[in-house]
Interface confidence: low
């Protein structure tokens, strides 16, 4: 029977800069029941606080609700593992909420084949930003990426859409069924998961000729 091994805070993520969650990996348990606590202070403060919510994020997590989240402060946090034989501490982790944002996937993905008489046909893709993100404040710039492929193909074709919420694709294989997905990331954060796939059948008369 031994003191617990050193835990590690391995990930912190925020969906929208208003709340965030951190997760840790326990070290070895030393063969005894082990309790974990996460403590933190915000830069500029000496006051140490304990994690406000160990439940919402699941096992080995700490969730910071709105009233505990400030995007203007760096959080300095550590996890303490304790059993009957002693304690061990994780390394301190510095967290800027601004830089850990991982939004939900974009919503309302719509895909349509457009065949204007006087121009080349194209695939028109449109979507909306995730609901939790408030773009009006100017605190967020969301960037978008689209991927698509014929249903039976192995390789995805990827297009960067910048800040646009619609995109046109010209070169497609007639008669194929395509899967289309979109994802987003804030300027300093992480890519969201891909949105659920939308399927579109490209007509056989979809011509790529001039």
């Amino acid at each position: 029977q031994l003191p617990p091994g050193k835990p590690e805070i391995f990930k912190c993520r925020s969906p929208n800069k208003e709340t965030f969650t951190c997760w840790w990996r326990p070290g070895t348990d030393g063969g005894l029941p082990t309790n974990y606590s996460l403590t933190y202070h915000r830069e500029g403060e000496t006051l140490m606080h304990e994690c406000p919510d160990y439940i919402t994020g699941g096992p080995n997590s700490c969730h910071f609700g709105k009233q505990y989240t400030s995007m203007w402060r760096t959080y300095i946090m550590m996890v303490n593992a304790t059993n009957q034989m002693g304690s061990s501490f994780s390394d301190e982790l510095y967290v800027d909420v601004t830089y850990i944002v991982q939004p939900d996937p974009p919503l309302e993905l719509a895909v349509e084949v457009k065949q204007p008489e006087d121009r080349k046909p194209y695939l028109w893709i449109k979507w909306s930003p995730p609901t939790l993100i408030d773009l009006k404040t100017g605190w967020f710039t969301l960037l978008y990426e689209i991927r698509l492929k014929p249903e039976k193909a192995a390789e995805w074709e990827i297009h960067f859409a910048g800040q646009q919420t619609e995109f046109k694709i010209l070169s497609l294989h007639p008669g194929q069924k395509y899967l289309v997905q979109v994802r987003c990331k804030p300027d300093h954060g992480y890519w969201s998961a891909w949105s659920p796939a939308t399927f579109i059948q490209i007509p056989s008369d979809f011509t790529m000729n001039d």
């Epitope: 830069e43 403060e45 000496t46």
Partner: antibody, heavy 118, light 112 residues
């Protein structure tokens, strides 16, 4: 070792502009908040501005808001302060400083003197 | 007017004596839980950090320098003054309502 080397000060007329630079070395520049602090001749220290690590967030003292702009180039390890619409009361030694956790300003540049006079 | 007020403004002390410098803030800075840092500035030089986070000494700072904080007040103590300690000392803290740093007006420490 940590070094902050400043440049860009000088004599300027009221209403004029200057750009101060602070070249950082000896540490991982993009890991730190950075600050500007000034000191008028014979007076105390006055905080001017700070900027977060990846630079979207900035704070300014009320006395310089709308006239001064802090920025940074993490690729060049350099901090800047653009001074516009300068006034006589902006005459001071300007120091750049590195921030750490709890934003302590633990390393300071040697200072660069800005004199606003006609 | 939000400020950090240092007292005394100047003090003259003999080598080997103990000196304390007080820094009084308000509920938006020191009293809000924000830490206090102390800087020493000698003529013609940039300030140097002597105490950070209320009572922590950076490496290389002699242990005669100590700091404490209670409520809206902070104190710098030099337990046995040396000639090289003659300088101006400043306290500093973050202020929430200004969203910026505040410095005290400085305390000039002279050797008798």
């Amino acid at each position: 070792q940590v070094q902050l080397v400043q440049s860009g000060g000088g004599l300027v007329q009221p209403g004029g502009s200057l750009r101060l630079s602070c070249a950082a070395s000896g540490f991982s520049y993009s890991d730190y908040w950075m600050h500007w602090v000034r000191q008028a001749p014979g007076k105390g220290l006055e905080w001017v501005s700070d900027i977060s690590r990846l630079s979207p967030y900035t704070n300014y003292a009320d006395s310089v808001k709308g006239r001064f702009t802090i920025s940074r180039d993490n690729a060049k390890n350099t901090l800047y302060l653009q001074l516009n619409s300068l006034r006589a009361e902006d005459t001071a030694m300007y120091y750049c400083a590195r921030g750490l956790d709890a934003r302590r300003m633990s390393y300071w540049g040697q200072g660069t003197l800005v004199t606003v006079s006609s | 007017d939000i400020q950090l007020t240092q007292s005394p403004s100047s003090v003259s002390v003999s080598v080997g004596e103990r000196v304390t410098i007080d820094c009084t803030g308000s509920s938006s800075n020191i009293g809000h839980g924000y830490v206090v840092h102390w800087y020493q500035q000698k003529p013609g030089q940039a300030p140097q950090l002597k105490i950070y986070r209320n009572n922590q000494r950076p490496s290389g700072v002699p242990d005669r320098f100590s700091g404490s904080k209670s409520g809206t007040d902070a104190t710098l103590t030099i337990s046995s003054l040396q000639a090289e300690d003659a300088a101006v000392y400043y306290c500093a803290a973050w202020d929430d309502s200004l969203n910026g740093w505040l410095f005290g007006q400085g305390t000039k420490l002279e050797i008798k």
